[in-house]
């Protein structure tokens, strides 16, 4: 039994890090493998993660972590019974994938303006709380070509757009994701999408 692709891990910079790897053949990850992880400091405990299957030869492990700080560094040991298959380390602050934003809402009651709001996925004391920027994806359910991305580079989790920039009388969907430049993070997963019917009054044409 050998590791084909070494574990790569990402942290939500709060409570979970997710590690994925591939074995050299079909593996029952939960019965055959264990990933041990330990915070590097005196008297820290070793924790055991039971991996789950992620495709035939793929395994995934969710490592529970206490409130991450930038100095945290973990040793990782992948075991198959008594055999050490791989040894490595992981610094969560260097491999961050933020949590997805939540509660995306489209407010259509402001005249001819769409207000999209969502929630920051971190509590105020978390370092990422004040460092997230967002991308909002809006698309038409009727026309696959009507697909647009708005970059929200300010901290407020909201976006205003003129309803007239979208077609009237049809349904749209929106979703949002986050990243933090300060930690050079990857993008978060997209939030669940929300749907609304876009309608606005066309201005009278003056001749």
């Amino acid at each position: 039994m050998k590791v084909l692709q070494e574990p790569t891990c990402v942290s939500d910079y709060m409570s979970i890090s997710t590690c994925e790897w591939k074995m050299n053949g079909p593996t029952n990850c939960s019965t055959e493998l264990r990933l041990l992880y330990q915070l590097v400091f005196l008297l820290s405990e070793a924790h055991t993660c039971i991996p789950e299957n992620n495709g035939g030869a793929g395994c995934v492990c969710h490592l529970l972590m206490d409130d991450v700080v930038s100095a945290d560094n973990y040793t990782l040991d992948l075991w198959a019974g008594q055999q050490l298959l791989w040894k490595g380390s992981f610094k969560p602050s260097r491999h961050v994938k933020p949590r997805a934003p939540g509660n995306l809402t489209v407010h259509t009651n402001v005249s001819d303006t769409l207000l999209l709001t969502w929630s920051n996925p971190y509590p105020p004391d978390n370092y990422l709380y004040n460092h997230l920027t967002y991308a909002v994806n809006i698309w038409s359910e009727n026309d696959p070509a009507d697909f647009r991305i708005y970059n929200v580079t300010y901290l407020e989790p909201s976006l205003r757009i003129a309803a007239s920039t979208l077609k009237s009388g049809i349904s749209y969907r929106a979703r949002v994701r986050a990243w933090a430049q300060c930690y050079n993070t990857t993008w978060s997963e997209w939030s669940p999408s929300t749907k609304w019917h876009n309608s606005y009054r066309e201005p009278f044409e003056q001749h």
């Epitope: 409570s15 979970i16 915070l39 400091f41 005196l42 008297l43 820290s44 405990e45 789950e52 969710h62 529970l64 972590m65 206490d66 409130d67 991450v68 700080v69 949590r99 997805a100 939540g102 509660n103 996925p121 509590p123 105020p124 004391d125 997963e189 939030s191 669940p192």
Partner: antibody, heavy 115, light 107 residues
Framework: QVQLVESGGGLVQPGGSLRLSCVAS????????MNWVRQAPGKGLEWVSY????????YYADSVKGRFTISRDNAKNSLYLQMNSLRDEDTAVYYC????????WGQGTLVTVSS | DIQMTQSPSAMSASVGDRVTITCRAS??????LAWFQQKPGKVPTRLIY???SLQSGVPSRFSGSGSGTEFTLTISSLQPEDFATYYC?????????FGQGTKVEIK
């Protein structure tokens, strides 16, 4: 091995105050965020409060906000819950529980609020 | 605040039965969900975290699934020691919230 021992429970009148303590051993307390969780007699679990190891930030359940205060003394390996303006509905066994996500619990201390 | 609704609140089952308990969140919590078991007079113990990750030392007859708002705890073959109360917990955001519990009793 990890051990959490709560104390300070007892009988108190409505409107009174009580201070619960939780002494930790078997791990580096200063590196762990901590929680208080309670359970009223014959009822379910209710999260009460959290204190972060990293920032010292605190969070509370709406039912205790403004009345309870969580704190810690890393030098004494101790977690505290100061409970003021106690009500009948605060009667419960109070557990301290360690992060991440309540991996270890104490045995609990019973708080009875009654006149 | 996020509400967690567990069902059923109580159930009777026999040794060897397959038992399923569900937990519904009032809003999306991704996979930030854990399951706990509590026996009478005892302290709760964590069975599952991150919706589907089995806690080390917990028998493999316990499994968890789900993401977003719908979650399930399954006991594939109920054993005598599994008669207890089970709670789900969301830790996606503060305040953290538990489900109201599901008591699994002997039929």
């Amino acid at each position: 091995q990890v051990q959490l021992v709560e104390s300070g429970g007892g009988l108190v009148q409505p409107g009174g105050s009580l201070r619960l303590s939780c002494v930790a051993s078997g791990f580096t307390f200063s590196h762990s965020s901590m929680n208080w969780v309670r359970q009223a007699p014959g009822k379910g679990l209710e999260w009460v409060s959290y204190i972060s190891r990293a920032t010292g930030a605190v969070y509370y359940a709406d039912s205790v906000k403004g009345r309870f205060t969580i704190s810690r003394d890393n030098a004494k390996n101790s977690l505290y819950l100061q409970m003021n303006s106690l009500r009948d509905e605060d009667t419960a066994v109070y557990y301290c529980a360690r992060e991440p996500v309540f991996d270890y619990w104490g045995q609990g201390t019973l708080v009875t609020v009654s006149s | 605040d996020i509400q967690m609704t567990q069902s059923p609140s109580a159930m009777s089952a026999s040794v060897g039965d397959r038992v399923t308990i569900t937990c519904r969140a009032s809003q999306d919590i991704s996979n930030y969900l854990a399951w706990f078991q509590q026996k009478p007079g005892k302290v709760p113990t964590r069975l599952i975290y991150a919706a589907s990750s089995l806690q080390s030392g917990v028998p493999s007859r316990f499994s968890g699934s789900g993401s977003g708002t719908e979650f399930t705890l399954t006991i594939s073959s109920l054993q005598p020691e599994d008669f207890a109360t089970y709670y789900c917990l969301q830790w996606s955001s503060y305040p953290r919230t538990f489900g109201q519990g599901t008591k699994v009793e002997i039929k």
